[in-house]
């Protein structure tokens, strides 16, 4: 589904949300670092309802959540976080 959002710059996200998403609605979070033709970092939230949301990396809630997840990184994460580049 996400492949539809490829642009000539190979970015996946054309629209980003800053709205808080509770963890119980989240399946996993994908972090796409800058590079591979996309000039910005992208965060993609895969929700349990099978929909996908691109989150503004500057959104306060996602920064706060990532900080919490970083602190817990030594234990099992309640929300899987995948950091990988697009091949």
């Amino acid at each position: 589904v996400l492949e539809v959002y490829y642009t000539s710059l190979r970015c996946r996200c054309v629209q980003e949300s800053s709205v808080f998403i509770p963890r119980r609605f989240i399946d996993r979070i994908q972090i796409l670092p800058r590079g591979n033709g996309c000039p910005r970092k992208e965060i993609i939230v895969w929700k349990k309802n099978k929909s996908i949301v691109c989150v503004d990396p500057q959104a306060e809630w996602i920064q706060r959540m990532m900080e919490v997840l970083r602190k817990r990184s030594s234990s099992t994460l309640p929300v899987p976080v995948f950091k990988r580049k697009i091949p």
Epitope: F20, I21, P22, K48, E60
Partner: antibody, heavy 120, light 107 residues
Framework: EVQLVESGGGLVQPGGSLRLSCAAS????????MSWVRQAPGKGLEWVAE????????NYAPSLKDRFTISRDNAKNSLYLQMNSLRAEDTAVYYC?????????????WGQGTTVTVSS | DIQMTQSPSSLSASVGDRVTITCKVS??????VAWYQQKPGKAPKLLIY???YRYTGVPSRFSGSGSGTDFTFTISSLQPEDIATYYC?????????FGGGTKLEIK
């Protein structure tokens, strides 16, 4: 237009049971989480329970989980709350609400409520 | 459970006044807070979600702010139709919890 209509309230004796219903229209009911929220006379709002579209995830207020059961029938666009061993403190207006997990991630549509009175 | 302490529990203000309600949360809820308006005999109506986002159709005089444990709801210029009880609610995690409410009256 989204409509949530609760029914099934009434007068019941302590220790009795009641089953509330919420009929939904104007929404794709089978896509949404749903909740029950109650409000005792002159008091604030108290969340009761929620259920996901597939009925595979259900969460309750800890103080109510042993006596109340939330369920749904997507084919009938209906939400239910089975209340057992009712007590005087369960007297309240019971609201059903749609829990949006697409945009707001909270309860964006509410019914008008049905009144439950527990008294001897 | 996450406790929501809302203040004041009641307040009286004049038309045109700026009104502020606060909600203190017992633990960090990120920006997972909503604000509702409830008029007597009616169901609550969603006004603000994600701490600061106005719900569809909500007038711009209503606003919200905050994150973590401290949240604020503001009516920039009170109108007669704003007379109601206002509730904060956290939806960061279950059990979902509400503040005790703030009953707003016109002077």
């Amino acid at each position: 237009e989204v409509q949530l209509v609760e029914s099934g309230g009434g007068l019941v004796q302590p220790g009795g049971s009641l089953r509330l219903s919420c009929a939904a229209s104007g929404i794709d009911f089978s896509r949404y989480w749903m909740s029950w929220v109650r409000q005792a006379p002159g008091k604030g709002l108290e969340w009761v329970a929620e259920i996901n579209p597939e009925s595979s995830t259900i969460n309750y207020a800890p103080s109510l989980k042993d006596r109340f059961t939330i369920s749904r029938d997507n084919a009938k666009n209906s939400l239910y709350l089975q209340m057992n061993s009712l007590r005087a403190e369960d007297t309240a207006v019971y609201y059903c609400a749609r829990q949006d997990d697409y945009e707001t991630y909270t309860m964006d549509y509410w019914g008008q409520g049905t009144t439950v009175t527990v008294s001897s | 459970d996450i406790q929501m302490t809302q203040s004041p529990s009641s307040l009286s203000a004049s038309v045109g006044d700026r009104v502020t309600i606060t909600c203190k949360v017992s633990q960090d809820v990120n920006t997972g807070v909503a604000w509702y308006q409830q008029k007597p005999g009616k169901a609550p109506k969603l006004l603000i979600y994600s701490a600061s986002y106005r719900y569809t159709g909500v007038p711009s005089r209503f606003s919200g702010s905050g994150s973590g444990t401290d949240f604020t709801f503001t009516i920039s210029s009170l109108q007669p139709e704003d007379i109601a009880t206002y509730y904060c609610q956290q939806y960061y995690s279950t059990p979902l919890t509400f503040g005790g409410g703030t009953k707003l009256e016109i002077k």
